[in-house]
């Protein structure tokens, strides 16, 4: 079995303001077992966009249905964009841990660009 | 942490009904199937079933299709199995268990409940 | 359906000893380039814990000394070197389908 990578296939997404970006990301094994992670930027900084363990995400939604036997797309959306969204977003993969997850890894990032909504 | 509570040990009479529960913590309950598994006293792991809490997607072991129920309830982050019809060879040690790769595998396993069935 | 059986239903080995034990399926359980099978270990009193999954990648925290192997319908779990904490019943599972289990094989020290 070849060690899984994290595909996101578009380097740049421009969206109109107040509308919804699609984020692409494919992993191309099950193989480790753990969730995915996206990030708006790099480093300790970074901003935690959505989380399939845990947490709340209103704006997010997922393109596919993650619960789904051999599910390897982990593509978001991300609703109502303003210019506060334009950045770097990176699909993570983790491996199931204990007691936590561990990052295992990332893809190459995809630049989203906000335009302003037409007047 | 992913954690998996299951309510206290049952006694039932043959022909009556149990409600066996299995409350999830640390993680998002509707991204992970739940899987109950039953223990005979000094047998083997029999699978009953599995549930999808985010569309209530089930799917029954054929032995247990006319008998099982399993229910979610994504507000409290709880699932329940009901057996109906109980038999003396019920008595066993009933398990929930979280798919924490939608492997239809069983990563995270609670405690277990023993329900009895005797006259 | 897919029969899981497992061989031995029991054994003893020395301490430090390799350990194996087999499941066979009634049918390959090899679908999408994976073989879905899973080994757990059931120690008394105790929920079963996942051990190998997909047929030979360890789980998080499990001893390297744990190994699962094989294809199609032929599947070994390895324990190079027995520990005391090793003692336990292991069963194997398929989910090509809707899951199954094998019967168990207990596995005790010499």
């Known amino acids: 079995e070849e060690e899984l990578q994290v595909i996101q296939p578009d380097k740049f997404v421009l969206v109109a303001a107040g509308e919804t970006a699609t984020l692409r990301c494919t992993a191309t094994s099950l193989i480790p077992v753990g969730p995915i992670q996206w990030f708006r930027g790099a480093g300790p900084g970074r901003e935690l966009i959505y989380n399939q363990k845990e947490g709340h995400f209103p704006r997010v939604t997922t393109v596919s249905d993650l619960t789904k036997r051999n599910n390897m797309d982990f593509s978001i959306r991300i609703g109502n964009i303003t210019p506060a969204d334009a950045g770097t977003y990176y699909c993570v993969k983790f491996r199931k841990g204990s007691p936590d997850d561990v990052e295992f890894k990332s893809g190459a990032g995809t630049e989203l660009s906000v335009r302003a909504k037409p007047s | 942490q992913v954690q998996l509570v299951q309510s206290g040990a049952e006694v039932k009479k043959p022909g009556a009904s149990v409600k066996v529960s299995c409350k999830a913590s640390?993680?998002?309950?509707?991204?992970?199937?739940i899987n109950w598994v039953r223990q005979a006293p000094g047998q083997g792991l029999e699978w009953i079933a599995m549930?999808?809490?985010?569309?209530?997607?089930?799917h029954y072991n054929q032995i247990f299709k006319d008998r099982a129920t399993l229910t979610t309830d994504t507000s409290t982050s709880t699932a329940y199995m009901e057996l109906r019809s109980l038999r003396s060879d019920d008595t066993a040690v009933y398990y929930c268990a979280m798919d924490y790769g939608s492997l239809y595998a069983m990563d995270y396993w609670g405690r277990g409940t023993l329900v009895t069935v005797s006259s | 359906d897919i029969v899981l059986t497992q061989s031995p239903d029991s054994l003893a080995v020395s301490l430090g000893e390799r350990a194996t034990i087999n499941c066979r399926a009634s049918?390959?359980?090899?679908?999408?380039?994976?073989?879905?099978i899973f080994w757990y270990q059931q120690k008394p009193g105790q929920p079963p814990k996942l051990l190998i999954y997909l047929a030979s990648n360890r789980d998080s925290g499990v001893p390297d000394r744990f190994s699962g192997s094989g294809s199609g319908t032929d599947f070994t779990l390895t324990i190079s070197s027995l520990q005391a904490e090793d003692v336990a019943v292991y069963y194997c599972q398929h989910s090509r389908e809707l899951p199954t289990f094998g019967q168990g094989t207990k596995l005790e020290i010499k």
């Open positions: 549930i999808d809490p985010s569309d209530s997607e089930t």
């Open positions: 640390g993680y998002t309950f509707t991204n992970y199937w």
């Open positions: 049918q390959s359980v090899r679908s999408s380039g994976y073989n879905w």
